[in-house]
Interface confidence: low
């Protein structure tokens, strides 16, 4: 199958790092500067992606390969590829559209990114509070008064936090 | 605020050479490659080609090769068209254009007019 | 060259009308569009990239949708402000190339 589709579509001999001309009768041309071309048979090369701003260069873009972008000391990244960048805040704090706020009261944030997460509701499980949350930390659960009974375990981890898909508007 | 301001009008002889000055301010010179356009009177726009930023390597499309070159002034965040021997079919307004995945931002165009 | 066609060269239309304008190229250009608008005595701002991509500041009345050779903007509810030029560039492979362009007139 490959040789028959190589002889009836010239473009398939073309390596990454080139493309496929057909202004110059399907030849193979190497990829004009700051473009790349990541696998073969390619009819053009993709601009390369330009890390500018709040973005820097993780990786220097190559003829067969784009550039890969992180975000600047105080952002970090958001979506597939790092294309966005999103302010950091301080742990006990959330970004919203006006900057980053301090968690409320009855919510944290342990994090530098993402949404302040309510505390754990101890008494959902059963269980009383051992520790009292602030804006940087979860609550930490106790056993209730009916399970101190030896051997019963005396703290119970607080529930995992989920991912936070936040980004400002 | 991204802005390309680009030089004003000329009125040239056939045979002359123009130089039009595209430049940029409001974001990092280098890093967009910048893109020419031609549009002539009462006709579509027409992609001449592009210069890298960082390395000042041009690149033209096929109908733009000879007469036609683009340079940089990086320290002045400047791109240039050059346009030798002149000839009125180059009569038309050019526009420079950052690109980044497309021509994103213009210049207002610089109109040249050659006639003798 | 891939060749971009606008088969429009001129749309009429009202203002509150939804108007779709098309885009034919000759070859598979997978979604590698562009969108601008150009009015009189201006030069061509970008609309949509990547064929569906608003562009920064760009009112959500405007659209870009398609796939393959063919691909439409759409206006929604269109204002007076809107006639122009409109102009889809492919950059699928160098040189970019322009179709040539649907004017939008206001009845």
């Known amino acids: 199958f490959e040789r028959t589709r190589s002889l009836q579509d010239p473009c398939s001999n073309c390596p990454a790092g080139t493309f496929c001309d057909n202004n110059r009768n399907q030849i193979c041309s190497p990829c004009p500067p700051n473009s790349f071309s990541s696998a073969g048979g390619q009819r053009t090369c993709d601009i390369c992606r330009q890390c500018k701003g709040v973005f820097r260069t993780r990786k220097e873009c190559s003829s067969t390969s784009n550039a890969e972008c992180d975000c600047t000391p105080g952002f970090h990244c958001l979506g597939a590829g790092c294309s966005m960048c999103e302010q950091d805040c301080k742990q006990g704090q959330e970004l919203t559209k006006k900057g980053c706020k301090d968690c409320c009261f009855g919510t944290f944030n342990d994090q530098k990114r993402g949404i302040c997460r309510p505390w754990t509701n101890c008494s959902l499980d059963g269980k009383s509070v051992l520790v009292n949350g602030t804006k940087e930390r979860d609550v930490v659960c106790g056993p209730s008064p009916a399970d101190l009974s030896p051997g019963a375990s005396s703290v119970t981890p607080p529930a995992p936090a989920r991912e936070p898909g936040h980004s400002p508007q | 605020q991204i802005q390309l301001v680009q030089s004003g009008p000329e009125l040239k002889k056939p045979g002359e050479t123009v130089k039009i000055s595209c430049k940029a301010s409001?974001?990092?010179?280098?890093?967009?490659?910048m893109h020419w356009v031609k549009q002539a009177p009462g006709k579509g726009l027409k992609s001449m080609g592009w210069?890298?930023?960082?390395?000042?390597?041009?690149t033209y499309a096929d109908d733009f090769k000879g007469r036609f070159a683009f340079s940089l002034e990086s320290s002045a965040s400047t791109a240039y068209l050059q346009i030798n021997n002149l000839k009125n079919e180059d009569t038309a307004t050019y526009f420079c254009?950052?690109?980044?995945?497309?021509?994103?931002?213009w210049g207002q165009g610089t109109s040249v007019t050659v006639s003798s | 060259d891939i060749v971009m066609t606008q088969s429009h060269k001129f749309m009429s239309t009202s203002v509150g009308d939804r108007v779709s304008i098309t885009c034919k190229a000759s070859?598979?250009?997978?979604?590698?569009v562009a969108w601008y608008q150009q009015k009189p005595g201006q030069f061509p701002k970008l609309l949509i990239y990547?064929?569906?991509i608003r562009h920064t500041g760009v009112p959500d009345r405007f659209t870009g949708s398609g796939a393959g050779t063919d691909y439409t903007l759409t206006i929604s509810s269109v204002q007076a402000e809107d006639l122009a030029l409109y102009y889809c560039?492919?950059?699928?492979?160098?040189?970019?190339?322009f179709g040539g362009g649907t004017k939008l007139e206001i009845k």
């Open positions: 560039q492919q950059r699928y492979t160098t040189p970019p190339t």
């Open positions: 990547w064929a569906s």
């Open positions: 254009a950052r690109y980044d995945y497309a021509m994103d931002y």
């Open positions: 070859q598979d250009v997978s979604s590698a």
């Open positions: 409001g974001y990092t010179f280098t890093d967009y490659s």
């Open positions: 210069i890298n930023t960082e390395t000042g390597e041009p």
